[in-house]
Amino acid sequence: EPPTACREKQYLINSQCCSLCQPGQKLVSDCTEFTETECLPCSESEFLDTWNRETRCHQHKYCDPNLGLRVQQKGTSETDTICTCEEGLHCMSESCESCVPHRSCLPGFGVKQIATGVSDTICEPCPVGFFSNVSSAFEKCRPWTSCETKDLVVQQAGTNKTDVVCGPQDRQR
């Protein structure tokens, strides 16, 4: 009786279980009662990452430098190319089809997490006692200067955008 289901790494065709082509190869001819499945290896620019019965290999992803992309990991016959973004850029989406510049944290905000090739800068507001007076993709909030440790006094209070201004203590005669 012809099979209705096949084992893993096989497929059913013409009431027969045929071996799937291994990753990195595509299907040329189905098996028969007398012959094995015929598979053909993919070329250097192509891949198939599963046991399959595809008649065409997939083209490797192209990391387009005009879109800010570069190759993070070269594809093989069994894996696709992995793209990442050039320095200062990150992927627009999970599929990383193009890149955008990292955002900068405005004055009053500091960098909580520096951007990577796949994630944007994460900013946080500077809490009391800290400030940031620059727009930057790298700088964290910096602590206000401690006037006391310099034997000075606060002449002007700090904000989230400005440091405190220290000055000499008033000398009593």
């Epitope: 189905d30 012959t35 015929e38 008649t55 016959s77």
Partner: antibody
Amino acid sequence: EVQLQQSGAELVSPGVSVKISCKGSGYTFTDHGMHWVKQSHAKSLEWIGVISTSYGVATYNQKFKGKATLSVDKSSSTAYLELARLTSEDSAIYYCARRDSKSPFDYWGQGTTLTVSS
Amino acid sequence: QIVLTQSPAIMSASPGEKITITCSASSSISSNYLHWYQQKPGFSPKLLIYRTSNLASGVPARFSGSGSGTSYSLTISSMEAEDAATYYCHQYHRSPLTFGAGTKLELK
């Protein structure tokens, strides 16, 4: 007995096209892909490509894209290699070959000699 | 593409002599995908050894093959007159499929 019978020798002028045939017999034609190989003095053996006789999908060596076209006629169990815009560089012996389960080329046609000359 | 370099290109041997032909691949290939063919003048190539070391049907036991990775070889333990031919290695590991340039073995 498995046989791959190729068409006869061709003497053609530069710039024209030629179509070489390969008729399979002694087996079910659509059970095996048909490969084509070029043999010239300069370059030894070169794989042109393969056509799936059942699905009709051809895969080419990049070097022969635009030069070679593979096709099949299932009703006559015949595979074809068409070569376009011929030059003296195309002068060679062309073989069709079929795989068994051991290697891609267990069975070969007798070869078709193509001479391109003005 | 994978380039297969055969050596020597031409050699001559006396009957009874041991012959070794080497085939070096430009990148590593699975031993399942390396084959050897024999071709005599005026004839089509004929499968000699498949998957590195398996003799094709009807091939005499004096022929053997070995190798792995990028280095493969074909050996004739004792040359006979009928072995005068051109030998080609061939890879099926990556498209485009490629052949070595051939080793012409002549009888001394």
